[in-house]
Interface confidence: medium
């Protein structure tokens, strides 16, 4: 029985040209994490495998950095990076847990404008 839950950073926004950390956390299970996949729609960005270590997709290696932890750092963001990201935890014996993050990359001026209206 799968008892675990994935907590994510949820819906996040970041400024064009900046960086963002995608984070997921698996809790409420004693299952062993054997691999974490980070995927964006139809593309796999990176894997962190217990045996193989980190492996970044060649097409993203200049803009994606592993970590912190099992998270993923996206750099030099463009508006095209807007969209859904999935953290996929392969565990034993539970199976697969998936978390979803929606990232919106904003033009610099929009991000600054929006910041004025954020509740502290």
């Amino acid at each position: 029985m799968m008892t675990g839950t994935i907590e994510t950073t949820g819906n996040i926004s970041a400024e064009k040209g900046g960086s963002i950390i995608l984070q997921c956390h698996l809790s409420s299970t004693t299952a062993q994490v054997t691999q974490v996949n980070w995927e964006q729609q139809d593309q796999l960005l990176a894997i962190c495998n217990a045996d193989l270590g980190w492996h970044i997709s060649p097409s993203f290696k200049d803009r994606v950095a592993p970590g912190p932890g099992l998270g993923l750092t996206l750099q030099s963001l463009t508006v095209n990076d807007t969209g859904e990201y999935f953290c996929i935890y392969h565990t034993y014996p539970d199976g697969t847990y998936t978390g979803r993050i929606f990232l919106e990359v904003l033009e610099s001026s929009v991000a600054e404008h929006g910041a004025r209206f954020q509740i502290p």
Epitope: E39, W54, F86, G95
Partner: antibody
């Protein structure tokens, strides 16, 4: 263009070891995983394991854990598979493949295979 | 490990006929979170390494003729050749790439009458 060049056919004695090589060219060797697949004459495909040339990390099919050892030399862009304590069951063609796990494809590049024959 | 079971083990058809082969996995290859299916189909001709035909259960690899179609659910998958050609003589393998080890099915041998 991308190429995987494998070492030539081997005739080896039972109880000995053999090391098969897979030389990669036409791409950045550390950017892609290399996997190995076994095929006995007239039989199906068996997945042996995979190596991350960037980190040296490996993941094996449990069946081959005591049989195969995967290594990689980044300086020469060569992946190796050593098979130990050879028996007639190890007589097979061994393929290396560039493991492209990122959205557009899986294993688009394979080596031609190396025939290993174990015979007294 | 995920066990992949293919059927039939062989089939013989005439050129122009439609062919369907099956692959069943012992565990689901569907990730419910992103709705991806981690199943691939390969074609292997005598004396050659395998060639990727289909990935994601239904996406044709670049350059693969559109007579090859993959479909299926989380555990039951099908490869269909709509109109078999003489050059399709080969063994067809399915493969799990959901989790290590990336197990293959035992293959379906296609013969042309």
């Amino acid at each position: 263009q991308v190429q995987l060049q494998q070492s030539g056919a081997e005739l080896v004695r039972p109880g000995t070891s053999v090391k098969v090589s897979c030389k990669a060219s036409g791409y950045a060797f550390s950017d892609y995983l290399i996997e190995w697949v076994k095929q006995r004459p007239g039989q199906g495909l068996e997945w042996i394991g995979v190596i991350n040339p960037g980190s040296g990390g490996t993941n094996y099919n449990e069946k081959f854990k005591d049989k195969a050892t995967l290594t990689a030399d980044k300086s020469s862009s060569i992946a190796y598979m050593q098979l130990s304590s050879l028996t007639s069951d190890d007589s097979a063609v061994y393929f290396c493949a560039r493991f492209h796990y990122y959205g557009s494809s899986l294993f688009p590049y394979w080596g031609p295979g190396t025939l290993v024959t174990v015979s007294a | 490990d995920i066990v992949m079971t293919q059927s039939p083990s062989s089939l013989s058809v005439s050129a122009g006929e439609k062919v369907t082969m099956s692959c069943k996995s012992s565990q689901s290859l569907l990730n419910s979170g992103n709705q991806k299916k981690y199943l691939a189909w390969y074609q292997q001709k005598p004396g050659q390494p395998p060639k990727l035909l289909i990935y994601g259960a239904s996406t044709r690899e670049s350059g693969v003729p559109d007579r090859f179609t993959g479909s299926g659910s989380g555990t039951d998958f099908t490869l269909t050749i709509s109109s078999v050609q003489a050059e399709d003589l080969a063994v067809y393998y399915c493969q799990n790439y959901h989790r290590f080890p990336f197990t293959f099915g035992s293959g379906t041998k296609l013969e042309i009458k």
